[in-house]
């Protein structure tokens, strides 16, 4: 497969990754699909430095990231280990709050207005950030 050596138009390069920042809102699953269909994934935050970069670009707006616990434990969409990885939750979060009246708890993580993380109802139409790594061979499946 080919390797991506520079970011696509309208994406921002940072530390050998490319980022795309939405200006509209989608439910978490639709945001996840959007990124996958761009050969990318919802942003996976692995360091304080990356947190600051993303926070700078999104501003004080609720924004989905690639972290969820819809199947039980918290998982990053790219397989990055959650337990040993970077975290930036708000105090007392995640809390899987059921009091919103929308049914179920809160299974999807987002950046809040101050950049720290909160879990929320996955159907809420928040902005989102896609990320793809440079120098990564394309994932084209073998032709049959």
């Amino acid at each position: 497969g080919s390797e991506r050596t520079c970011c696509p138009v309208n994406w921002v390069e940072h530390e050998r990754s490319c980022y795309w920042f939405s200006r509209s809102g989608k439910a978490w699953a639709d945001a996840d699909n959007y990124c996958r269909l761009e050969d990318a994934h919802l942003v996976v935050v692995t360091s304080w430095e990356e947190q600051k970069f993303v926070q700078h670009h999104i501003g004080p707006v609720n924004t989905w990231m690639g972290l969820h616990d819809q199947n039980g434990p918290w998982k990053w969409v790219d397989g990055t280990d959650y337990e040993t990885g970077f975290k930036n939750w708000r105090p007392e979060q995640p809390d899987d709050w059921y009091g919103h009246g929308l049914g179920g708890g809160e299974d999807c993580a987002h950046f809040t207005d101050d950049g720290r993380w909160n879990d929320d109802v996955c159907q809420r139409p928040y902005r989102w950030v896609c990320e793809t790594e440079l120098d990564k061979a394309s994932q084209e499946p073998p032709l049959l």
Partner: antibody, heavy 121, light 106 residues
């Protein structure tokens, strides 16, 4: 001129396999998601599958999941559909189509002429 | 699974305005596209992102989408507009088409 040209349709027996292709020209193929859409005789449009521009993500209609495989070769500007375990209800005209932008937001703005697949014994 | 519902047929006289509806649960939260298909031909995109027209599509074609209904409106109907029209949207990892509406010009 932006163009999509399908080839490889035909008559196949139930349970059989068929692979056909769609040659693209006139646009940057690798920058666009692509889809297969089918239309049974006298019926409406039915989406079959979509693949991202780089080929890393694929999605399928429930009716074909596990039987059909979409793939692409960006070096050849070609889209493929491998169809296995064919059934009579797979009989249709199959169109390849180019997405104008991300499929979650946009429509398919270029369509091929269609290739006919008939599943019959 | 998600469904988009269209009226099977709509009839209108030349010069009049035709409106074709497409209904689905919270469709207004998604983007709707519309396709025109004439007999024996491939579909043609006439509206995307609810109300945008691709180049080459006449201004007579317009779209809207809110609540549970998307609408394709064709003003100043001409005989050449007689065709099948399909709405389409993305939902839960699938592309969904409406059943199609046959537009007849009287």
């Amino acid at each position: 001129e932006v163009q999509l040209l399908e080839s490889g349709g035909g008559l196949v027996q139930p349970g059989g396999s068929l692979r056909f292709s769609c040659a693209a020209s006139g646009f940057t193929f690798s920058s666009h998601a692509m889809s297969w859409v089918r239309q049974a005789p006298g019926k409406g449009l039915e989406w079959v599958s979509v693949i991202s521009g780089g080929g890393s993500s694929t999605y399928y209609a429930d009716s074909v999941k596990g039987r059909f495989t979409i793939s692409r070769d960006n070096s050849k500007n070609t889209l493929y559909l491998q169809m296995n375990s064919l059934r009579a209800e797979d009989t249709a005209v199959y169109y390849c189509a180019k997405w104008r932008g991300n499929p979650t937001d946009y429509g398919m703005d270029v369509w091929g002429q269609g290739t006919t697949v008939t599943v019959s014994s | 699974s998600y469904e988009l519902t269209q009226p099977p047929s709509v009839s209108v006289s030349p010069g009049q305005t035709a409106s074709i509806t497409c209904s689905g649960d919270k469709l207004g939260d998604k983007y709707a596209s519309w396709y025109q298909q004439k007999p024996g031909q491939s579909p043609v995109l006439v509206i995307y992102q609810d109300n945008k027209r691709p180049s080459g599509i006449p201004e007579r074609f317009s779209g809207s989408n809110s609540g549970n209904t998307a609408t394709l409106t064709i003003g100043g109907i001409q005989a050449m507009d007689e065709a099948d029209y399909y709405c389409q949207a993305w939902d839960s990892s699938t592309v969904v088409f409406g059943g199609g509406t046959k537009l007849t010009v009287l």
